[in-house]
């Protein structure tokens, strides 16, 4: 049996043009599903907002390395994959689409879910 068949899929259709202050970030997700138009990083802010960022940008690569290091320092075993609702208020400066697919993204976080706003949800067959 495939794992987590109905896990949500987050897709990014555009990236933030602004560099987010590192101090505002709590976690990130890697988006790699072939159902999405491009690979992406979704940063989750401390206010539970989700921001799509270009994983090729040097600042994005630096930020996710810092988040990885901080994550390991704070709680080494709390990495988990997204299988619940998106943890977000309306995403910043981006279009973010939700679809249903097994293990669409990998989340790096220590916090629990909050209500998702302004994100469409469709089922992919």
């Amino acid at each position: 049996q495939p794992d987590a068949v109905n896990a949500p899929l987050t897709c990014c259709y555009s990236f933030t043009s602004k560099m987010i202050p590192m101090s505002r970030l709590e976690s990130y997700k890697r988006i790699t599903s072939s159902r999405c138009p491009k690979e992406a990083v979704v940063f989750v802010t401390k206010l539970k907002r989700e921001v799509c960022a270009d994983p090729k940008k040097e600042w994005v690569q630096t930020y996710i390395k810092n988040l990885d290091r901080n994550q390991m320092r704070s709680e080494p075993t709390t990495l988990f994959k997204t299988a619940s609702a998106l943890r977000s208020s309306a995403p910043l400066n981006v279009k973010l689409t939700r679809k249903s697919e097994a293990n669409a993204s990998t989340t790096f976080s220590t916090t629990t879910s909050s209500t998702s706003v302004g994100v469409t949800s469709v089922t992919v067959n």
Partner: antibody
């Protein structure tokens, strides 16, 4: 659906060069990195290097720096890997793969390169 | 460069067995570890990324764990289609490096 289709098998003489192609469909190669990995007969996997097709920037394992060249043609969604000064130890299956994060979720079928006099 | 040491290099097991493969990095790779399965004459197939995250369509009998320098791939109940060679790979820093592989054979 993402698909990577590689060019056919090659037999080369020592000292010569080989150029392997990898045509991508189902994705815009400008949005990812294209990597090259090789596997000698009965051996493990070895990363050669990668290209950012959007700007042509490359990164190599120091072992291949200067001998490997990776290029990409975004108009045809094709990545290329050329290896020069071939020796018998370069006999291997060469794979292209995609992945912006450094792991590889889609792979080509592999191209066998045999270096023999 | 970060070296990856995989063990065992080969193992014999029966259908239904629980199989564990380990991978050790020469430095902390902060969970940036991938596991691949490769069958003869085929390209590797990504099973797990980020040390624990199962790829789409990969059966739940596969799981990954670990942190820091030490990581594990577990197959909870070996199936006939699981006989293959498994590789770990670190993607913390380039050059990206693979473990030497573990061949899982039929006992």
């Amino acid at each position: 659906q993402v698909q990577l289709v590689q060019s056919g098998a090659e037999v080369k003489k020592p000292g010569s060069s080989v150029k392997v192609s990898c045509k991508a469909s189902g994705l815009n190669i400008k949005d990812t990195y294209m990597h090259w990995v090789r596997q000698a007969p009965g051996q493990g996997l070895e990363w050669i290097g990668r290209i950012d097709p959007a700007n042509g920037n490359t990164k190599f394992d120091p072992k291949f720096q200067g001998r490997a060249t990776i290029t990409a043609d975004t108009s045809t969604s094709t990545a290329y890997m050329e290896l020069s000064s071939l020796r018998s130890e370069d006999t291997a299956v060469y794979y292209c793969a995609r992945g912006v994060f450094g792991f590889f979720d889609y792979w080509g079928q592999g191209t066998t390169v045999t270096v023999s006099s | 460069d970060i070296q990856m040491t995989q063990s065992p290099s080969s193992l014999s097991a029966s259908v239904g067995d629980r199989v564990t493969i380990t991978c050790k990095a020469t430095e902390d790779i902060y969970n940036r570890l991938a596991w691949y399965q490769q069958k003869p004459g085929k390209a590797p197939k990504l099973l797990i990324s980020g040390a624990t995250s199962l790829e789409t369509g990969v059966p739940s009998r596969f799981s990954g764990s670990g942190s820091g320098k030490d990581y594990t791939l577990t197959i909870s109940s070996l199936q006939p289609e699981d006989f293959a060679t498994y590789y770990c790979q670190q993607f913390w820093s380039a050059p990206y490096t693979f473990g030497g592989g573990t061949k899982v054979e039929i006992k």
